[in-house]
Amino acid sequence: RAPRCRELPAQKWWHTGALYRIGDLQAFQGHGAGNLAGLKGRLDYLSSLKVKGLVLGPIHKNQKDDVAQTDLLQIDPNFGSKEDFDSLLQSAKKKSIRVILDLTPNYRGENSWFSTQVDTVATKVKDALEFWLQAGVDGFQVRDIENLKDASSFLAEWQNITKGFSEDRLLIAGTNSSDLQQILSLLESNKDLLLTSSYLSDSGSTGEHTKSLVTQYLNATGNRWCSWSLSQARLLTSFLPAQLLRLYQLMLFTLPGTPVFSYGDEIGLDAAALPGQPMEAPVMLWDESSFPDIPGAVSANMTVKGQSEDPGSLLSLFRRLSDQRSKERSLLHGDFHAFSAGPGLFSYIRHWDQNERFLVVLNFGDVGLSAGLQASDLPASASLPAKADLLLSTQPGREEGSPLELERLKLEPHEGLLLRFPYAA
């Protein structure tokens, strides 16, 4: 008799793929544009990235550091009207893109939470949650919660409101903290909270340290659903050298949890390459005309247009990974097992029941080397085969689809491999 199939876990929409943050509408759209109507015109692009949710804003009225002139129920007219927002919601729904609204109150000011008037602000947030849930948003994000006194109890209350409306609604909290204990204390009191933090930004870009951070986090959080990013808002290029961007994309898309990206991460958008642009929100490079300030500063291969035409680009890799992440059971909700490998390497298996299994091998170092996969670290349920098919490499040159002998597997500097192999009874 065939073995019984393992029961599928309940999957919420945010379990099925990546979230895409657009914190600054104007920077995202560029050319002096930057409103909700313009964003609606970019939804096809988001669809092409196969992201499941758009984390938008903040877009509410906020006069810097003035609590009285901060209205979480009103859209700043610079971004458009409530009608524009409703229209965006409808269009997004048609494309199966969920909309999460950032309600961080004092986003233009010094302290995101008006630290002297916490109770006033908390009431405003409560009212806003109810208002925007009725308006049809799929969830909320609040950032900088390390600046919010009694954050855990407020988050629990806001979570109750959100989940009370529908189990299908999501609350995301963001913190600048990278301290695991602080992160765990925030998570402890909030069962379904998705938390973005700077935890992984301390990885020091080495395989051993990244492995240790990931496994510590997963062990500490147990069965709860995680999110993976390098910060609550900033671009990957703020933390990583260009040669590690592909590696991190592969890792974020294949770890168990929801990958969260900022606009531009998919093309390696880098504020440092655009003189005069703010580090936290540089202009999105749709094409070479997106940054006219310095002629010639932007080459085609830095842009969405240029990378869309190049199958070997970072954008093409992002799209492929996003697609795999959203359709393969082992990547959607599979078990995770990390195991030892050569120096500078981080390798792990994702597997679910009798479905196709995935092996990820990441070389964080700038030295090519034999993978040295230590299969003895793995439980019997996740053993390695002699060969696995190469689904993709983060670097050009390998023949995709070809079987690779795992015992003789060698990685290039900064190369990541995604390999697949069938379940074997």
């Epitope: 260009a242 040669q243 050569g342 120096p343 700038d366 030295v367 090519g368 080397l369 034999s370 040295g372 050009p396 040159g397 390998r398 003789r408 060698k410 290039e412 500097p413």
Partner: antibody, heavy 120, light 111 residues
Framework: EVQLVESGGGLVQPGGSLRLSCVAS????????MHWVRQAPGKGLVWVSR????????RYADSVKGRFTISRDNAKNTLYLQMNSLRAEDTAVYYC?????????????WGQGALVTVSS | QSVLTQPPSVSGAPGQRVAISCTGN?????????VHWYQQLPGTAPQLLIY???DRPSGVPDRFSGSKSGTSASLAITGLQAEDEAAYYC???????????FGGGTKLTVL
């Protein structure tokens, strides 16, 4: 056929400068990391420097740090080694070397070498 | 003083087997970095002989083999021939020096 041809060697006084060039052919130069390795007369091989395929990652041996500069021009299929503040102990044959792909960073092709003599 | 230690010389008669050792430490061979071997015939540039501890590039006879264990590696040559007379170098990467390191070289004499 992979070929690496060094030039620019010669006799130079201590404290002087020299620039070595290496023209590559027979492979896609812009896809490979490259190295310089030297060998003093009658002695063993010593690694000098390494540069990645687009020139953004560079490493040097401690003995040449601050004095030697590796660079490349992918449009010209050429690797360079600018050597300043030369010392007698820099006297050696300098090899231009390609780093193999999928070989664990082995050095799979070597030029014939350029002799640099530092003497007064 | 080389980071990787090789015997200065070895010798053997034609047809015999010889082995050349290469000893490192926990920041190079012992750390898991690959060992490669090069042959340098008199008056010529070195040539890659073994890569990734035990793999042979095409064109290298199967008389040459490599192995690695712990902090050491070894090159074995069977069926020794006169044309094998050369200097042999092992090479690896060293994480504490953050650079490529070579053994001092071993001169093989075919008697």
């Amino acid at each position: 056929e992979v070929q690496l041809v060094e030039s620019g060697g010669g006799l130079v006084q201590p404290g002087g400068s020299l620039r070595l060039s290496c023209v590559a052919s027979g492979f896609t130069f812009s896809s490979y990391w490259m190295h310089w390795v030297r060998q003093a007369p009658g002695k063993g091989l010593v690694w000098v420097s390494r540069i990645n395929s687009d020139g953004s990652i560079i490493r040097y041996a401690d003995s040449v740090k601050g004095r030697f500069t590796i660079s490349r021009d992918n449009a010209k299929n050429t690797l360079y080694l600018q050597m300043n503040s030369l010392r007698a102990e820099d006297t050696a044959v300098y090899y231009c070397v390609r780093e193999g792909r999928y070989t664990g960073s082995s050095l799979d092709y070597w030029g014939q070498g350029a002799l640099v003599t530092v003497s007064s | 003083q080389s980071v990787l230690t090789q015997p200065p010389s070895v010798s053997g008669a034609p047809g015999q087997r010889v082995a050349i050792s290469c000893t490192g430490n926990n920041s190079n061979i012992g750390a898991g970095y690959d060992v490669h071997w090069y042959q340098q015939l008199p008056g010529t540039a070195p040539q890659l002989l073994i890569y990734g501890n035990s793999d042979r590039p095409s064109g290298v006879p199967d008389r040459f083999s490599g192995s690695k264990s712990g902090t050491s590696a070894s090159l074995a040559i069977t069926g020794l021939q006169a044309e094998d007379e050369a200097a042999y170098y092992c090479q690896s990467y060293d994480s504490s020096l953050t650079g490529w390191v070579f053994g001092g070289g071993t001169k093989l004499t075919v008697l």
